[in-house]
């Protein structure tokens, strides 16, 4: 049997899980008592074509309902397990009240209000994210959809649509919630060193500390076997055997264009004359290959105060 759920004091409309031609009559029964459900609209629970309407729903309406489609050749019976829940007291929507998750990835994305097509609703549909009304211009409600412009991971969360069902001159509230997750389309690329520039010379003062950042970008999304590191005279810093010169482990960063980048900082506690003759290589590598930018150190010229 299929399952449907609703909230106490809201409208709930369900469709017979067995499908037949729209012209065939559908009868609904309380499964446990076999009692027929009437079609008269004055009842709180009544049948309308293949739909069963709870206007409004109550917790005690929970149970199994049977629908029978009477066609000339055979009768088809479907069963529907209906559960009516009390409204959650807090903003945390329990899993059992959640419709299917929507996965977004494009720059613009839409979330459809679940089950809305079963109701006689009128625009606008109100949208809430984690219980807060959405008022930013990035969020646009159109018909039964919520459009989100320039989707980011911050847009992930639980989205609730609220609309009004009109029946017999009475309006009933309906709410439905679903999760939205953002799947960023990732790619890996040949590393690009953003700092230091190619064949760069950096000015330093003898006896003073110096630090040089090696930064590179590798694409978008999680990166496997990606690294940035320093070499001194083609030797990794750890093996160079100079305690004054240390490498600070790579930090994850994002660049302005949303690329995933890593940075490693080379720190020299007190620059010596010998350091000026060394070659410093900033290396970036991943499964696509390796790139290096070599830099040299030059003594800073004293400012002439004449």
């Amino acid at each position: 049997s299929k399952s449907s759920w609703g909230l106490e004091n809201e409208a709930l409309i369900v469709r017979c899980p067995q499908r037949g031609r729209s012209t065939y009559p559908v009868e609904w029964y309380y499964s446990d008592t076999n009692e027929s459900i009437p079609t008269q609209k004055r009842n709180r629970i009544f049948v309308s074509r293949d739909r069963l309407k709870f206007l409004p729903a109550r917790v005690e309406d929970s149970g199994i309902y049977a629908c029978v489609i009477r066609s000339p050749n055979l009768n088809k019976t479907g069963y529907l397990n209906v559960t009516i829940h009390k409204k959650p007291p807090s903003c945390n929507i329990p899993d059992y009240l959640m419709y299917s998750t929507v996965r977004g990835s494009d720059k613009n994305f839409k979330i459809t209000c679940p089950t809305i097509d079963l109701y006689n609703w009128t625009a606008p549909v109100q949208w809430f994210k984690n219980c807060k009304a959405l008022q930013e211009p990035r969020f646009r409600a159109h018909r039964s959809y919520l459009f989100i412009d320039n989707v980011t991971h911050d847009d992930e969360g639980d989205y609730t649509c609220q609309f009004t069902h009109a029946e017999n001159g009475t309006n009933y509230i309906v709410t439905a919630t679903r999760s939205f997750t953002v799947e960023e389309k990732g790619f890996s690329m040949f590393p690009v060193i953003t700092n230091p520039p190619y064949n760069h010379t950096m000015e330093v003062e003898i006896g003073k500390p110096a630090s040089i950042a090696c930064s590179a970008c590798f694409g978008k999304g999680s990166h496997f076997l990606a690294d940035v590191l320093w070499q001194i005279n083609k030797t990794v810093v750890g093996n160079f055997g100079e305690a004054r010169i240390q490498e600070e482990e790579g930090r994850n960063e994002s660049s302005s264009n949303d690329m995933d980048c890593l940075t490693s900082v080379l720190r020299i506690t007190g620059v010596t004359e010998k350091d000026l003759s060394l070659e410093y290589d900033c290396l970036a590598l991943n499964l696509h290959g390796m790139i290096r930018h070599t830099i040299r150190l030059r003594r800073k010229q004293p400012i002439d105060h004449r």
Epitope: S105, K185, G186, F187, S188, F190, G219, G221, S222, H223, F224, L225, A226, D227, L229, V236, L283, L285, N286, L287, H288, G289, M290, I291
Partner: antibody, heavy 125, light 107 residues
């Protein structure tokens, strides 16, 4: 010619560890990354992790993070994959493979161009 | 991770048949697609890289095509030694993921 030769089959108890070796020959070991892939009986290929020997940079896919350690010994041109806390579902053939990109001229396409013969690891109590 | 879906999961064919295997990526992967052949008890062998480039030593009856999300491996005239399992693999984004495999069996 390029060859990757793996260590022999292993039978292990649940909870123990296994270390599989992969000896490379016929090319400059440090210039290429080595990855490890496993294949459970009758199943597809699952990437575990890899290493870039020249820098010792190793990385692991999420499924194996914390349970696998990949190392390389430049002096013997050998890569190792150690998998700990073994369970019965780790019974599989473990392959090492070379990534086709040469780190020193950044030539080549992106693929696993040479593979070891595979090492069957059976986890059973 | 990028999902790779191969179809069919298995097929029966006769020697001399033209065989086509398709691979679909869950997002566009340009032409970063490889095909491997694996025989029972053996390691996979690279057949095609970059969607359509034949690896050296691979017979010319194997060809690959496609870009974006849809790719095809074609064996123009199936030979007895071609009965094996074929895997596609994307190299657009790490980890480089494989399809679930297509087993080519003798009819």
């Amino acid at each position: 010619q390029v060859q990757l030769v793996q260590s022999g089959a292993e039978v292990k108890k649940p909870g123990s560890s296994v270390k599989v070796s992969c000896k490379a020959s016929g090319y400059t070991f440090t210039n290429y990354a080595i990855i490890w892939v496993r294949q459970a009986p009758g199943q597809g290929l699952e990437w575990m992790g890899g290493i870039i020997p020249v820098f010792g940079t190793a990385d692991y896919t999420q499924t194996f993070q914390g349970r696998v350690t990949i190392t390389a010994d430049e002096s013997t041109s050998t890569a190792y994959m150690e998998l700990s806390s073994l369970r019965s579902e780790d019974t599989a053939v473990y392959y090492c493979a070379r990534v086709s990109t040469n780190y020193y001229d950044s030539s080549g396409y992106y693929a696993f161009d040479y593979w070891g013969q595979g090492t069957l690891v059976t986890v059973s109590s | 991770d990028i999902q790779m879906t191969q179809s069919p999961s298995s097929l029966s064919a006769s020697v001399g048949d033209r065989v086509t295997i398709t691979c679909r990526a869950s997002q566009s992967i340009s032409s970063y697609l490889n095909w491997y052949q694996q025989k029972p008890g053996k390691a996979p062998k690279l057949l095609i890289y970059d969607a359509s480039s034949l690896q050296s030593g691979v017979p010319s009856r194997f060809s690959g095509s496609g870009s974006g999300t849809d790719f095809t491996l074609t064996i123009s005239s199936l030979q007895p030694e071609d009965f094996a399992t074929y895997y596609c693999q994307q190299t657009y984004h790490t980890p480089w993921t494989f399809g679930q495999g297509t087993k080519v069996e003798i009819k």
